[in-house]
């Protein structure tokens, strides 16, 4: 029969023959030959391979370095890498989450549109008319101005995006 030029899934071509790839979680220790099968062995502790492969070395699990603000979100297995995330109050600087930075705070005049997560920073928005924020915060949204009318008061000082309105008693005109 003609030697193959392509192999089935989970196989690879070597010296005109199809050989089995190693399954995820295992590395190649000996190639198949004309007379022998592929030999694979499990990855060691703290190692992984996540695909059908012919790798001679397993990959090291990612280390979630606490000095960089990282912690383990999901422990790695022989078939998966460790997933890191950031400590409370911090978020990843990249998709790979190799280090963390402190969540940004929204300055006065801005409120939190979206609270930060382990992988995304705080999203701030300017307080629209009728709303204010007088603090720098990673959690506070823009607050609505106080409604003086509902308290039977009148606006003595207009609000801004950084300050609330100041209410005062109504001037009662005597008859």
């Amino acid at each position: 029969p003609e030697p193959p030029t392509a192999c089935r899934e989970k196989q690879y071509l070597i010296n005109s023959q199809c050989c089995s790839l190693c399954q995820p979680g295992q590395k190649l220790v000996s190639d198949c030959t004309e007379f022998t099968e592929t030999e694979c062995l499990p990855c060691g502790e703290s190692e992984f391979l996540d695909t059908w492969n012919r790798e001679t070395h397993c990959h090291q699990h990612k280390y979630c370095d606490p000095n960089l603000g990282l912690r383990v979100q999901q422990k790695g297995t022989s078939e998966t890498d460790t997933i890191c995330t950031c400590e409370e109050g911090w978020h990843c600087t990249s998709e790979a989450c190799e280090s963390c930075v402190l969540h940004r705070s929204c300055s006065p005049g801005f409120g939190v549109k979206q609270i930060a997560t382990g992988v995304s920073d705080t999203i701030c928005e300017p307080c629209p008319v009728g709303f204010f924020s007088n603090v720098s915060s990673a959690f506070e949204k823009c607050h609505p101005w106080t409604s003086c009318e509902t308290k039977d008061l009148v606006v003595q000082q207009a609000g801004t995006n950084k300050t609330d309105v100041v209410c005062g008693p109504q001037d009662r005109l005597r008859a």
Partner: antibody, heavy 116, light 107 residues
Framework: EVQLVQSGAEVKKPGSSVKVSCKAS????????INWVRQAPGQGLEWIGW????????YCNEQFKGRVTITVDKSTSTAYMELSSLRSEDTAVYYC?????????WGQGTLVTVSS | DIQMTQSPSSLSASVGDRVTITCKAS??????VAWYQQKPGKSPKLLIY???NRYTGVPSRFSGSGSGTDFTLTISSLQPEDFATYFC?????????FGGGTKVEIK
């Protein structure tokens, strides 16, 4: 039929280098790892390292790091092992052997003598 | 590095004898062990791979067994052409390492 044919015996001075060749035939050269193994007179076998001709990847025994260079010439299906800073303890028969892990095919060996 | 301790280092036997050579690994190598035969002035020849699989063309009197750290090569009935030196090798992890060898001599 798979064949690995090595270069001839060498006599070298301490501190010099030696380059041993291994010409492969009878199979697709780029498909199989080529290993280098040595055997001092009357002694056991010691693995030096491998090269995968398909990619040029090399993996060496730490004991030889910095002193050994393993290369291939795909156009002639030949692998080379160069050992530098030779000392008398490097006197040995140097073998090339193909396949990863287990060594199914061996060259005939090259005797390297290091002597002043 | 994984040490492969082979014993005995030499033995004397007669044609027809059953011969057993052992190899002990300093840590588990699972079944990634090969056995080679070497005659004076010649290159080693692969006999057994993956601890117990006989390589093509190797006579059935040669057999291998073991896993983890303890491995055995057995020659069931020694023949005149079997007088040689035998080596075990682990290929579970780098660097690959060999046993010191067992010389089988004629009694």
């Amino acid at each position: 039929e798979v064949q690995l044919v090595q270069s001839g015996a060498e006599v070298k001075k301490p501190g010099s280098s030696v380059k041993v060749s291994c010409k492969a035939s009878g199979y697709t050269f780029t498909d199989y790892y080529i290993n280098w193994v040595r055997q001092a007179p009357g002694q056991g076998l010691e693995w030096i390292g491998w090269i995968f001709p398909g990619s040029g990847s090399v993996y060496c025994n730490e004991q030889f790091k910095g002193r050994v260079t393993i290369t291939v010439d795909k156009s002639t299906s030949t692998a080379y092992m160069e050992l530098s800073s030779l000392r008398s303890e490097d006197t040995a028969v140097y073998y090339c052997a193909s396949s990863l892990g287990k060594f199914a095919y061996w060259g005939q060996g090259t005797l390297v003598t290091v002597s002043s | 590095d994984i040490q492969m301790t082979q014993s005995p280092s030499s033995l004397s036997a007669s044609v027809g004898d059953r011969v057993t050579i052992t190899c002990k690994a300093s840590q588990s190598v699972v079944t990634a062990v090969a056995w080679y035969q070497q005659k004076p002035g010649k290159s080693p020849k692969l006999l057994i791979y993956s601890a117990s699989n006989r390589y093509t063309g190797v006579p059935s009197r040669f057999s291998g067994s073991g896993s983890g750290t303890d491995f055995t090569l057995t020659i069931s009935s020694l023949q005149p052409e079997d007088f040689a030196t035998y080596f075990c090798q682990q290929y579970s992890s780098y660097p690959y390492t060999f046993g010191g060898g067992t010389k089988v001599e004629i009694k």
